[in-house]
């Protein structure tokens, strides 16, 4: 719960907190910014980003968005709040614990975008919703 | 009873160094992921810096990243942060803050120290 000795007013987002009344930690994303890239036609990709940050605020979630045009590949990865939208659109799966992959209609481009909260959880994108399923240590979980 | 105890606060001049100690003691503090958290006058918490364990792998808020180091000596319970390069928006009170699931998807734990304060100022 909040320490009765941490200061708590000045203004409403000065301390997040759960349903239980226990602080919200910020958890750590990948944030690289805008970067070239290499992930094309695979099911899933490693951000290689070397870049792992403490987001400034507790409800922000790692983000990834993945674009490919005539010129080039890049991958941007960063914390957001998604309350706010980003490039336009709502971070739909923010409370996802994977980062996987939507499409979204850019005009010149190719776009896809996905959020999660878990942390790092933007150094691995999921372009292929099956592949949740396929990973073999999973399918051993859930037939044992 | 979980406790953390912070010492080593205090007025330094701009530039200068400053190493925060917390003392932990009440629960195993070698498993515990520990957190450096600061409030400056009139502002929300800001997370600066944390520790996991095992492993040992720190992480940092930019704003501290290069001039802060976080560390931990299991043997003592004791949790330092070394802070160099010193800048007046430094200045706050830094609480040594430790967070563990409870079990419960996304929900969390956590305690905190009385925290320390330090100022910086010339």
């Known amino acids: 719960t909040i320490p009765p000795h941490v200061q708590k007013s000045v203004n409403n987002d000065m301390i997040v907190t759960d349903n239980n009344g226990a602080v919200k930690f910020p958890q750590l994303c990948k944030f690289c910014d805008v970067r070239f890239s290499t992930c094309d036609n695979q099911k899933s990709c490693m951000s290689n980003c070397s870049i792992t940050s403490i987001c400034e605020k507790p409800q922000e979630v790692c983000v990834a968005v993945w674009r490919k045009n005539d010129e080039n590949i890049t991958l941007e990865t960063v914390c957001h709040d998604p309350k706010l939208p980003y490039h336009d659109f709502i971070l739909e799966d923010a409370a996802s614990p994977k980062c996987i992959m939507k499409e979204k209609k850019k005009p010149g481009e190719t776009f896809f975008m996905c959020s999660c909260s878990s942390d790092e959880c933007n150094d691995n994108i999921i372009f292929s919703e099956e592949y949740n399923t396929s990973n073999p240590d999973l399918l051993l979980v859930i037939f044992q | 009873e979980v406790q953390l105890l912070e010492s080593g606060g205090g007025l330094v001049q701009p530039g200068g160094s400053l190493r925060l100690s917390c003392a932990a003691s009440g629960f195993t503090f070698g498993t515990e992921q520990m957190w450096w958290v600061r409030q400056a006058p009139g502002k929300g918490l800001e997370f600066i810096s944390?520790?996991?364990?095992?492993?040992?792998?720190?992480y940092y808020a930019d704003s501290v990243k290069g001039r802060f180091t976080i560390s931990r000596d299991n043997s003592k319970n004791t949790l330092y942060l070394q802070m160099n390069s010193l800048r007046a928006e430094d200045t706050a009170v830094y609480y040594c803050?430790?967070?563990?699931?409870?079990?419960?998807?996304?929900?969390?734990?956590?305690?905190w120290g009385q925290g320390t304060l330090v100022t910086v100022s010339s």
């Open positions: 944390r520790i996991d364990s095992p492993g040992g792998r720190t």
């Open positions: 803050a430790k967070r563990r699931p409870t079990g419960v998807s996304g929900t969390f734990y956590d305690y």
